[in-house]
Amino acid sequence: IVLRPSRVHNSEENTMRALTLKDILNGTFSYKTFFPNWISGQEYLHQSADNNIVLYNIETGQSYTILSNRTMKSVNASNYGLSPDRQFVYLESDYSKLWRYSYTATYYIYDLSNGEFVRGNELPRPIQYLCWSPVGSKLAYVYQNNIYLKQRPGDPPFQITFNGRENKIFNGIPDWVYEEEMLATKYALWWSPNGKFLAYAEFNDTDIPVIAYSYYGDEQYPRTINIPYPKAGAKNPVVRIFIIDTTYPAYVGPQEVPVPAMIASSDYYFSWLTWVTDERVCLQWLKRVQNVSVLSICDFREDWQTWDCPKTQEHIEESRTGWAGGFFVSTPVFSYDAISYYKIFSDKDGYKHIHYIKDTVENAIQITSGKWEAINIFRVTQDSLFYSSNEFEEYPGRRNIYRISIGSYPPSKKCVTCHLRKERCQYYTASFSDYAKYYALVCYGPGIPISTLHDGRTDQEIKILEENKELENALKNIQLPKEEIKKLEVDEITLWYKMILPPQFDRSKKYPLLIQVYGGPCSQSVRSVFAVNWISYLASKEGMVIALVDGRGTAFQGDKLLYAVYRKLGVYEVEDQITAVRKFIEMGFIDEKRIAIWGWSYGGYVSSLALASGTGLFKCGIAVAPVSSWEYYASVYTERFMGLPTKDDNLEHYKNSTVMARAEYFRNVDYLLIHGTADDNVHFQNSAQIAKALVNAQVDFQAMWYSDQNHGLSGLSTNHLYTHMTHFLKQCFSLSD
């Protein structure tokens, strides 16, 4: 299936040009999306091109500037947040990145009623997290690992927690491992729907081993970065959840929410918190051995001033074939009765589907079914449930938005997006206003992305929010590669692949092949999305064929494929890449003497193992920031898929699945190993150990480190990285410079 046909006609060929590496590094062909910042059922805010903050009313068609670019510029603001009562705006400046989601910033409060910044009781700096209450203009913020509350922006703060300590106790913000591997947020505090209560997590990292690495900087002596980072099998953070009444917080103080007994009996994690009403909250917990999850619904008992979590409101989710959930355990979406909820989990056939839970999980009513997966529940209203799935035309790498009418019986299902712009748009996400009165659809491809606004009742398109016209025009004289998404059937396994082909691809010719791999559990690389990136350039200008393959362990095709890698990472992911390469060779247009593989992070691990597989298939390959042993990676992630590195659990496979154990097998391939020295995520230690093993085995290899760079290798390092990798591949494939 040709998803992005080349627009080359013979008459135009001489005016067309190939992509250059410079195009990619400069972001010449990047696209824009439009996500409305909803502030009511029919209003949203958006930052205009000239940086004014504009309020749009869909129903009146009117718009007005609520905050001028002049005000933004006066404090160098890069972000903003309007208080729900619309009286104040916080302005964020001095952004300073920490880890993947976390950053610190300076915050200024602007009073819209008098057009002045709030003076007196200003916020301290830098702040780790700040947010408005959902109603009114209370502020909660985290400063130096403690939580503070302001009843009004001009009021003095009330300190809620006092035990916060750098790298020891984290209140209202996650520690490293919870941020990266569990919550995927920079915050760990949650307002109740009307702002009566504030829930927060406390993470105690006192006993966690610390990863230490040098940050070279410009000084005479390097700094040492210390991060409490639990590797597989190590001591984990101790988490507690508290709730405080924000009306009179000094009276009762923070109240701890009890952990379900079956969870508290051994090491456990807190996985998410969902407010249902102001006096009902839902917490999700997970055993350290991550195949048992408990959803606990707790109620505020006014007479006792406490949170009660009855056993009758505990719902257990257990996996017998793998770990609980997909990448994370799904979160519930509560219905209007404030007790029943919708949740995605595996059905009896092993496909993740929406279920309706009214009393017990055992009595759950299955809402969607089929040999495809429901992926996200966007919104539940009184009569509709909006969700995304990959059902349409049986392509797992697509995302369409569906509406199920839950107000009628039997419920009827409608695909909202399937036929809107069928060739251009097959991968959608959505953003809903209050009560789903309106919604925005953001299409990511395979054609040029487009964002549109729709009526939540009729699904009618109201207007185009962003169609990337400039990008479309810029691409008119570019020879883009062709893209195909197809599948291979091998030994009862379906391997979906995306192939990126040179513009003048000719099946009778032979092309060098580059496999781009990620392959991590519950990931998906073969997606119907638009991208003009490095591999687009390699196909367009350098005439390579690039393939991405989703093998065992990848997501959205059922539990059989997903959980195949459970407790044995590094085996089937590699096998399936190799199997696919063999199939590609059989297609007749691959030069089997010029095959390479590359990957980043988990992909670096897989590419390293593929190169060291001893198949003789690969001439060369690149591993960027690879994991080299699962004993070196984070407990939460690693143990989810591998269990514990103990003799009585899975130590043997931990040892067998290292890159170092295969050092000898790198002798007959060209290997380029790349890592940032300040990688907080996949520590430089991983590559250091690969290098040591290769040296000890007297195996030649190439390497590049990026001083003071993290897992993302950003900024100028990006340019250097892709230039360096391009040279390496061109040399490997004997392509002239």
């Epitope: 009330f158 300190q159 009179y248 000094a250 009762v252 923070p254 701890e256 001033q305």
Partner: antibody, heavy 117, light 108 residues
Framework: EVQLLESGGGLVQPGGSLRLSCAAS????????MSWVRQAPGKGLEWVSA????????YYADSVKGRFTISRDNSKNTLYLQMNSLRAEDTAVYYC??????????WGQGTLVTVSS | EIVLTQSPGTLSLSPGERATLSCRAS???????LAWYQQKPGQAPRLLIY???SRATGIPDRFSGSGSGTDFTLTISRLEPEDFAVYYC?????????FGQGTKVEIK
């Protein structure tokens, strides 16, 4: 009906120790933060210490930090104040009060601590 | 710490009269964290007002509180014989919580 009953006061020499107790009834003791507030003879009220619902959270006035220890036994519905290294200026009526940092909505009748040689 | 200064130190009034007691904070206090107490000789303090203006359970409506920032007021609209006592304001905004030195309302 909420009741707080302090005990354990008395005469003690400077440098000595005393342990005050406060027996609570009429409410779910384990769900509330509790405090000790004292009043020197003929003087005003001074907050001494508080303990949160979770026993790990304790707070002290600078004047008693390192000498006094607040604790609670939820199974016995009792609040304690262990007072060591007592000084003459610790002489006061000690009240047990329901609440964290305020408001304190219920108070005990108080127990007199006299530090004198 | 926040210092609360009450004035006047003593207020001499007759039953039936209006009493206005002032409490000034050394730094801003959010109204949620200000309370007033009444104490009679030989007795424990009793909570009258919390959140600067909310009456505690069982407190007659002749007692009212107001104010914000650094200035707070307790008003007794018509003094009853049982109202003659010492009144304290208290803040819970910052640790340590602090009390004013008290205002004594005595019979004239």
């Amino acid at each position: 009906e909420v009741q707080l009953l302090e005990s354990g006061g008395g005469l003690v020499q400077p440098g000595g120790s005393l342990r005050l107790s406060c027996a609570a009834s009429g409410f779910t003791f384990s769900s509330y933060a509790m405090s000790w507030v004292r009043q020197a003879p003929g003087k005003g009220l001074e907050w001494v210490s508080a303990i949160g619902v979770s026993t790990g959270s304790t707070y002290y006035a600078d004047s008693v930090k390192g000498r006094f220890t607040i604790s609670r036994d939820n199974s016995k519905n009792t609040l304690y104040l262990q007072m060591n290294s007592l000084r003459a200026e610790d002489t006061a009526v000690y009240y047990c009060a329901k609440g964290w940092l305020g408001p304190f909505d219920y108070w005990g009748q108080g127990t007199l601590v006299t530090v004198s040689s | 710490e926040i210092v609360l200064t009450q004035s006047p130190g003593t207020l001499s009034l007759s039953p039936g009269e209006r009493a206005t007691l002032s409490c000034r904070a050394s730094q801003s206090v959010s109204s949620s964290y200000l309370a007033w107490y009444q104490q009679k000789p030989g007795q424990a303090p009793r909570l009258l007002i919390y959140g600067a203006s909310s009456r505690a359970t069982g407190i007659p409506d002749r007692f009212s509180g107001s104010g914000s920032g650094t200035d707070f007021t307790l008003t007794i609209s018509r003094l009853e014989p049982e109202d003659f006592a010492v009144y304290y304001c208290q803040q819970g905004q910052l640790i340590p919580p602090t009390f004013g030195q008290g205002t004594k309302v005595e019979i004239k």
